[in-house]
C-alpha cells in the first residue's frame, strides 16, 4: 500500500508568495506621475513579479505632526480620489493581487504615532480599519510600532477587527527593533500578526550567523507563520552589498514564511547610486530616463527595462524564485531543516510529504568553498540523496538541470544554489 498523504495545511493568500511594498507612490512611478491612477497602469508589472500582495502607502491625509489634520479615512488628493482607489482595488483583484493599506498615522511627521494623543490616534485607526475593510482592502500595515505605547494591546484589538471581518484579511505590524525578545513579546499576544522587523538586518556577515539568527527565530516562534525581510520599509541595498543581493533573494524566497520586499529590491535599486535621492524612497528605475538629475548615473542594467531583457539579471532571478515559491508545495508550506555544511555556509532542506524536495546552500563568504553537507544533522524524513538537480544558481555559468554530486559540491564566492530532488520512500 502507498503511504497516506499528509493532510494539507490551511493556506491563506499571504502564505502563497511574496508581498511587495510601495511606500512612496511618487518615487515608485517617477516623480510628477505618482498617483493611484498611474499605479493601476503598473499592475501588469507586479503580476510579472508573481507577488501576491501589494502593501500600499500610507496615502491618507496627514499634515505633519498635526493630529487634527490627519484623516485616515481620506486619501491625500495628491495621490488621487476614493474612486481612483476603488478602481485600483478592482483592477488588482482581477489580477489576483491583494491590496494592503498602510495606516501608519503620522507618516510625514517626526513620531509616526504622535507622542501625546495615543488614545485619539488609536480610535482613528479603529474607525479606519472598519471603513477600509468595507471598501474592500485585503489587509493593513502599521509601522514603527515601537513608538506606539501599549502596542500589544492595540494590535490585538486591531487584529480582532480585521479577523472579525474575515479570516482572509491580514494585519502587518512593522518595527525597527532587531531584538528577538521585543519581537516575541509583540507576537505573543497576537496570534496571526505578520511582523516585519530589522531582525535580519545585521545578518550579512557570515553563513553561521545567518543560520543562527534564522533557526533561533523559527525555534522561538514555533509553528506560527513568519515573514522574512531585512526591515519594515527600507531597501535591501540599505543593508547589503551588491554581491549579496542574489543570495538574499534566494534565501528570503525559500525560508518558511512570507517574503516581504520593497519596490526596487527586484532590480537592486540603490539610493546611494542616485545622488540627491532620498535613502528611504529613491525613484524607481523603469528605464534610463527615470533619473535625469545626474547625467550618466543610470546605465541600462540598473533598470527594469534593461534587466527584463537579460535572463541573467537580478530581476530575472527574482521572477524565477517568485514563480517557484508560489507553486511548489515544499516551498509553500514545507518543513524546514537547517544543517551544517561547513564554515561560511548556510544550508537547509524544504520538504513536504511526497512532493519534490529542495536543498538550499548559501555561501556568504568572499572565497569559494567546498560544502561538507552533514546529513547526520537531518531527521530520517528529510534525508539527502547522493545527487540533486540544479534548479538555479545565483551566479552565471552553471548548467541548470544537471545533477550535482552533493559530496563534491563547490560554491563560488557569494553563490547560492537551489537544488531539487524527488521524495524517496
Amino acid at each position: 500500500r502507498a503511504p497516506r498523504c499528509r493532510e494539507l495545511p490551511a493556506q491563506k493568500w499571504w502564505h502563497t508568495g511574496a508581498l511587495y511594498r510601495i511606500g512612496d507612490l511618487q518615487a515608485f512611478q517617477g516623480h510628477g506621475a505618482g498617483n493611484l491612477a498611474g499605479l493601476k497602469g503598473r499592475l501588469d508589472y507586479l503580476s510579472s513579479l508573481k507577488v501576491k500582495g501589494l502593501v500600499l502607502g500610507p496615502i491618507h491625509k496627514n499634515q505633519k505632526d498635526d493630529v487634527a489634520q490627519t484623516d485616515l479615512l481620506q486619501i491625500d488628493p495628491n495621490f488621487g480620489s476614493k474612486e481612483d482607489f476603488d478602481s485600483l482595488l478592482q483592477s488588482a483583484k482581477k489580477k489576483s493581487i491583494r491590496v494592503i493599506l498602510d495606516l501608519t498615522p503620522n507618516y510625514r511627521g517626526e513620531n509616526s504615532w504622535f507622542s501625546t494623543q495615543v488614545d485619539t490616534v488609536a480610535t482613528k485607526v479603529k474607525d479606519a480599519l472598519e471603513f477600509w475593510l468595507q471598501a474592500g482592502v485585503d489587509g493593513f500595515q502599521v509601522r514603527d510600532i515601537e513608538n506606539l505605547k501599549d502596542a500589544s494591546s492595540f494590535l490585538a484589538e486591531w487584529q480582532n477587527i480585521t479577523k472579525g471581518f474575515s479570516e482572509d484579511r491580514l494585519l502587518i505590524a512593522g518595527t525597527n527593533s532587531s531584538d528577538l525578545q521585543q519581537i516575541l513579546s509583540l507576537l505573543e499576544s497576537n496570534k496571526d500578526l505578520l511582523l516585519t522587523s530589522s531582525y535580519l538586518s545585521d545578518s550579512g556577515s557570515t553563513g553561521e550567523h545567518t543560520k543562527s539568527l534564522v533557526t533561533q527565530y523559527l525555534n522561538a516562534t514555533g509553528n506560527r507563520w513568519c515573514s522574512w525581510s531585512l526591515s519594515q520599509a527600507r531597501l535591501l541595498t540599505s543593508f547589503l552589498p551588491a554581491q549579496l543581493l542574489r543570495l538574499y533573494q534566494l534565501m528570503l524566497f525559500t525560508l518558511p514564511g512570507t517574503p516581504v520586499f520593497s519596490y526596487g529590491d527586484e532590480i537592486g535599486l540603490d539610493a546611494a547610486a542616485l545622488p540627491g535621492q532620498p535613502m528611504e524612497a529613491p525613484v524607481m528605475l523603469w528605464d534610463e530616463s527615470s533619473f535625469p538629475d545626474i547625467p550618466g548615473a543610470v546605465s541600462a542594467n540598473m533598470t527594469v527595462k534593461g534587466q527584463s531583457e537579460d535572463p541573467g539579471s537580478l530581476l530575472s532571478l527574482f521572477r524565477r524564485l517568485s514563480d517557484q515559491r508560489s507553486k511548489e508545495r515544499s516551498l509553500l508550506h514545507g518543513d524546514f531543516h537547517a544543517f551544517s555544511a561547513g564554515p561560511g555556509l548556510f544550508s537547509y532542506i524544504r520538504h513536504w510529504d511526497q512532493n519534490e524536495r529542495f536543498l538550499v546552500v548559501l555561501n556568504f563568504g568572499d572565497v569559494g568553498l567546498s560544502a561538507g553537507l552533514q546529513a547526520s544533522d537531518l531527521p530520517a524524513s528529510a534525508s539527502l540523496p547522493a545527487k540533486a538537480d540544479l534548479l538555479l544558481s545565483t551566479q552565471p555559468g552553471r548548467e541548470e538541470g544537471s545533477p550535482l554530486e552533493l559530496e563534491r559540491l563547490k560554491l563560488e564566492p557569494h553563490e547560492g544554489l537551489l537544488l531539487r530532488f524527488p521524495y524517496a520512500a
Partner: antibody
Framework: EVKLVESGGGLVQPGGSLRLSCVTS????????MTWVRQPPGKALEWLGF??????????EYSASVKGRFTISRDNSQSILYLQMNTLRTDDSATYYC?????????WGQGTLVTVSA | DIVMSQSPSSLAVSVGENVTLTCKSS????????????LAWYQQKSGQSPKLLIY???TRESGVPDRFTGSGSGTDFTLTISSVKAEDLAVYYC?????????FGGGTKLEIK
C-alpha cells in the same frame, strides 16, 4: 548666465539665530536642487545639505552636524534659497556658500561670512 | 560615514613640473551597477569660491584645461596636473557623492616654488 549671490552673514552671539539668503538668476530655479556648503576660516569645505527640486517635492537632506538646528528652504516665486540657522555655536563660524545641484557642484556663490562669538 | 583623506596636506612644485594629488576613501566609491566612481575634484584659489574640475573620478568639467586628469577607482584616487602653471596655485578638494553625507576631503594646498 548662472548667478548665485549670498547675503545675511554677520556677527551673532552663541545661541543666537541667523537667516542667510541666496538670490539666484540665469536658470529655471524650480528645476534644480540647491545646496549649502560652509568653510571655517583656513579649513576644509563641509557639505551641509540641500533642498530638492520641484520634481522631487522640494524635500531636504542634512548633514548630521546641523540636522535639527539648520533649516533649508526656498522661495520659488522669487528664486531665493534660504538657510535658517538656530542655536548657533562658535564652531559654526565659517563662510557659507550656496551652490546649484545636489552632488557635483558646478555653480557657486561668492559666500557670506558668519562669525559666532560672545 | 565614509571618511575622505587627502595627501599630502601641502606641497610645493616648480612651474612646468607634473604633480599628483591623492585622495583615499574609507569605503569603495565604485558602484557595480554602472561601473562609476562617485568622486569629484574641486579647485579653490585664495579668496575665491571652489570650482568643479572633475566628476565621476575622471570626467573633466567643460572648460577645464586638459592638463587636469582624474584617475583611480574604488578607494584610491588621484588628480594629476601635468606641466603645472603659476595659476594652478590653489587648494584642491576631493568630494564623494555616493551616499550621504557628501563629504569633502581635508584638501591639498599646492604652492609654487
Amino acid at each position: 548666465e548662472v548667478k548665485l549671490v549670498e547675503s545675511g552673514g554677520g556677527l551673532v552671539q552663541p545661541g543666537g539665530s541667523l537667516r542667510l539668503s541666496c538670490v539666484t538668476s540665469g536658470f529655471t530655479f524650480t528645476d534644480y536642487y540647491m545646496t549649502w556648503v560652509r568653510q571655517p576660516p583656513g579649513k576644509a569645505l563641509e557639505w551641509l545639505g540641500f533642498i530638492r527640486n520641484k520634481a522631487n517635492g522640494y524635500t531636504t537632506e542634512y548633514s548630521a552636524s546641523v540636522k535639527g538646528r539648520f533649516t533649508i528652504s526656498r522661495d520659488n516665486s522669487q528664486s531665493i534659497l534660504y538657510l535658517q540657522m538656530n542655536t548657533l555655536r562658535t564652531d559654526d563660524s565659517a563662510t557659507y556658500y550656496c551652490a546649484r545641484d545636489p552632488a557635483t557642484l558646478a555653480y557657486w556663490g561668492q559666500g557670506t561670512l558668519v562669525t559666532v562669538s560672545a | 560615514d565614509i571618511v575622505m583623506s587627502q595627501s599630502p596636506s601641502s606641497l610645493a612644485v616648480s612651474v612646468g613640473e607634473n604633480v599628483t594629488l591623492t585622495c583615499k576613501s574609507s569605503q569603495s566609491l565604485l558602484y557595480s551597477g554602472n561601473q562609476k566612481n562617485y568622486l569629484a575634484w574641486y579647485q579653490q584659489k585664495s579668496g575665491q569660491s571652489p570650482k568643479l574640475l572633475i566628476y565621476w573620478a575622471s570626467t573633466r568639467e567643460s572648460g577645464v584645461p586638459d592638463r587636469f586628469t582624474g584617475s583611480g577607482s574604488g578607494t584610491d584616487f588621484t588628480l594629476t596636473i601635468s606641466s603645472v602653471k603659476a595659476e594652478d596655485l590653489a587648494v584642491y578638494y576631493c568630494q564623494k557623492y555616493y551616499g550621504y553625507p557628501y563629504t569633502f576631503g581635508g584638501g591639498t594646498k599646492l604652492e609654487i616654488k
